[in-house]
């Protein structure tokens, strides 16, 4: 069964910078990835970026840079302009879609005990699965 993993990390050099890493574990090719925060896409979450493997990416503040790391994983750099680092308590969700077969989504957040620069362990929390 396909799965999605999500990792959130705080940059050691800039405490106001976060990076979300997401990956798809399963067969098939990915046709679209949506990253949202505050909850799953379409269920209270706000879109941060949409990535297409051929057509490029679209992103919205506070997303700074969205990019493909491999054919089945992406990263999204975030710039926190506020002083209180609200990202530390935020849930980030990644939805991987393979049109028209289905989509898979998981969410993750930075563990409260995380030290700057240390990556959070994979925390797949399946939200939505294709039939």
């Amino acid at each position: 069964t396909p799965e999605v993993w999500v990792q959130v990390q705080m940059e050691a050099t800039e405490l106001s910078s976060f990076t979300v890493h997401c990956g798809f574990l399963g067969p098939g090719s990915i046709s679209l990835v949506t990253v949202s925060w505050g909850g799953p896409d379409g269920a209270g979450g706000t879109k941060l970026a949409v990535l297409h493997p051929e057509l490029g990416t679209r992103q919205w503040a506070p997303a700074r840079q969205a990019r493909w790391e491999t054919q089945s994983s992406i990263s999204l750099a975030l710039e926190d302009s506020g002083a209180s680092s609200p990202f530390a308590n935020t849930t980030f969700c990644c939805k991987f879609a393979s049109f028209p077969e289905g989509s898979w989504e998981s969410c993750g957040s930075l563990p409260p005990s995380s030290d700057p620069g240390l990556s959070a362990p994979p925390t797949p929390v399946p939200i939505l699965r294709a039939d």
Epitope: G42, L55, F99, P100, L128
Partner: antibody, heavy 120, light 106 residues
Framework: EVQLVESGGGLVKPGGSLKLSCAAS????????MSWVRQTPAMRLESVAT????????YYPDTVKGRFTVSRDNAKNTLYLQMSSLRSEDTAIYYC?????????????WGQGTSVTVSS | QIVLTQSPAIMSASPGEKVTMTCSAS?????MFWYQQKPGSSPRLLIY???NLASGVPVRFSGSGSGTSYSLTISRLEAEDAATYYC?????????FGAGTKLDLK
């Protein structure tokens, strides 16, 4: 301007075959997933075939699987639907539609439709 | 496959009124779309991904919902809005449509 123009519809007897065409223009045809959607006399819409990845992957609902075949010729910017073993319930207006990736694969452009009547 | 149930099947409203129609899914939906179809014409995309307006669609149209419950709202009805409205989903194949809501003007 994006245009999709279907052709090939007509009257056919039950058990017969028909091949529909959809000529595309105004966009890079090979970059887009395409679908055939039919509208029954009761005005219900039903997706009957979808083709992606340059024609490698095709998808059909159970109602037409094994009877309909979707294909595309990217050099000719044309989408096809080969229909065989036709039944009266296949009577409908057949539309071709384009899926826009960044609109989450919504069908953002539709042709004008071609009518298929299956009757003895 | 996911079955979409639209309600009401037929509705009538006056120009200037606010109108809401719903689309209920038999199981949770990943992506929801709305189309408008006028007699003798092909369907036209109105809303993509639940709530985003397609190009050229007036701002009086809006979409909302999540999971299995979705709706399309027209804030101030105009004469040109008389049409049949269809919801459509893709979560896994096959792509499916609702039976439509026919909107007539009084």
């Amino acid at each position: 301007e994006v245009q999709l123009v279907e052709s090939g519809g007509g009257l056919v007897k039950p058990g017969g075959s028909l091949k529909l065409s959809c000529a595309a223009s105004g966009f890079t045809f090979s970059n887009f997933a395409m679908s055939w959607v039919r509208q029954t006399p009761a005005m219900r819409l039903e997706s009957v075939a979808t083709i992606v990845n340059g024609g490698i992957n095709t998808y059909y609902p159970d109602t037409v699987k094994g009877r309909f075949t979707v294909s595309r010729d990217n050099a000719k910017n044309t989408l096809y639907l080969q229909m065989s073993s036709l039944r009266s319930e296949d009577t409908a207006i057949y539309y071709c539609a384009r899926h826009d990736d960044f609109l989450y694969y919504a069908m953002d452009y539709w042709g004008q439709g071609t009518s298929v009547t299956v009757s003895s | 496959q996911i079955v979409l149930t639209q309600s009401p099947a037929i509705m009538s409203a006056s120009p200037g009124e606010k109108v809401t129609m719903t689309c209920s899914a038999s199981s949770s939906v990943s992506y929801m779309f709305w189309y408008q179809q006028k007699p003798g014409s092909s369907p036209r995309l109105l809303i993509y991904d639940t709530s985003n307006l397609a190009s050229g669609v007036p701002v009086r149209f809006s979409g909302s919902g999540s999971g299995t419950s979705y709706s399309l709202t027209i804030s101030r009805l105009e004469a040109e809005d008389a049409a049949t409205y269809y919801c459509q989903q893709w979560t896994s194949y096959p792509l499916t449509f609702g039976a439509g809501t026919k909107l007539d003007l009084k």
